[in-house]
């Protein structure tokens, strides 16, 4: 991954914090709840982007070359945005305009654009859709996706908080 200009860490931190809050507002748990655990078997990881040790999102990895980690976060945001655009969230029960879900979608797009290098190719994913006999899955899937997104955003927010605290270029006073 080539080194390119660093993102606006402070703005990313603010947006990711806001996203965390929106994700919880969009799907507040019924009771006490732990975030989904990340330790899955290799064969069940499938296509869900997870921020892992080898992604360079630790303090040293970010210092050496933050682009590895940022690429992983970009992939994750694109993956979840794709799911939020799918039939799972578009079908009944319909989501109200300006609902927490709509705000979440808009903010997810905002952070993606902030991180998206101009020449970055868009990855194509197949849109999941539910057949008429699978409609019962929709509320469960919405819950499942949002829970997973909450876990992903919690880690991303920590990355941006660290970046804002340690990697922001100091302002050079002009004469």
């Amino acid at each position: 991954v080539p080194r390119s200009s660093s993102p606006d860490w402070a703005q990313c931190q603010q947006l990711s914090r806001n996203l965390c809050m929106l994700a919880w507002n969009a799907h507040a748990p019924a009771g006490h709840m732990n975030l989904l655990r990340e330790e899955e078997d290799e064969e069940t990881k499938n296509n869900v982007p997870r921020i892992q040790c080898e992604d360079g999102c630790d303090p040293q990895g970010l210092k050496d070359n933050s682009q590895f980690c940022l690429q992983r976060i970009r992939q994750g945001l694109a993956f979840y945005k794709h799911l939020l655009d799918s039939d799972i969230f578009k079908g009944e029960p319909a989501l109200l305009p300006d609902s927490p879900m709509e705000q979440l979608h808009t903010s997810l797009l905002g952070l993606s654009q902030l991180l998206q290098p101009e020449d970055h190719p868009r990855e194509t994913q197949q849109m999941p859709s539910l057949s008429s006999s699978q409609q019962w899955q929709r509320p469960l899937l919405r819950s499942k996706i949002l829970r997973s997104l909450q876990a992903f955003l919690a880690i991303a927010a920590r990355v941006f908080a660290h970046g804002a605290a340690t990697l922001t270029e100091p302002l050079v006073p002009t004469a």
């Epitope: 748990p29 019924a30 009771g31 709840m33 732990n34 989904l36 655990r37 330790e39 899955e40 078997d41 069940t44 990881k45 499938n46 869900v48 799911l83 999941p128 899955q137 469960l140 899937l141 819950s143 499942k144 996706i145 829970r147 997973s148």
Partner: nanobody, 124 residues
Framework: EVQLVESGGGLVQAGGSLRLSCAAS????????MGWFRQAPGKEREFVAA????????YYANSVKGRFTISRDNAKNTVYLQMSGLKPEDTAVYYC?????????????????WGQGTQVTVSS
């Protein structure tokens, strides 16, 4: 892999009650939700109810809403289906299933674990 064992099925009169249990073992930390499904002779397996393992949110098929209650005891790694106001059309083999948190495009799909089933017969 999660292993599931159902119990509690049997023969009951219409209007009666039964409580099914599903004991889970193995990698239960990777489970997103537990569900109950049923299959009547000559029919496809259908969704009955589900509960998220961690949050305890519940979901029901319209046909059982108000009559069936799904609950869980995380300490015992067990999920229950309390069935009341049973009707002859509730007669079926009831299956317990565990849905993994890792598959985000389907629930209780190919990566789910299934029990062997327990027979529920409601006589009129």
């Amino acid at each position: 892999e999660v292993q599931l064992v159902e119990s509690g099925g049997g023969l009951v009169q219409a209007g009666g009650s039964l409580r099914l249990s599903c004991a889970a073992s193995g990698r239960t930390f990777s489970v997103y939700a537990m569900g109950w499904f049923r299959q009547a002779p000559g029919k496809e397996r259908e969704f009955v109810a589900a509960i998220t393992w961690s949050g305890g949110e519940t979901y029901y098929a319209n046909s059982v809403k108000g009559r069936f209650t799904i609950s869980r005891d995380n300490a015992k790694n067990t999920v229950y289906l309390q069935m009341s106001g049973l009707k002859p059309e509730d007669t079926a083999v009831y299956y317990c299933a565990a849905d993994p948190s890792s598959d985000l495009v389907t629930v209780f799909g190919d990566s789910a674990s299934w029990g062997q089933g327990t027979q529920v017969t409601v006589s009129s």
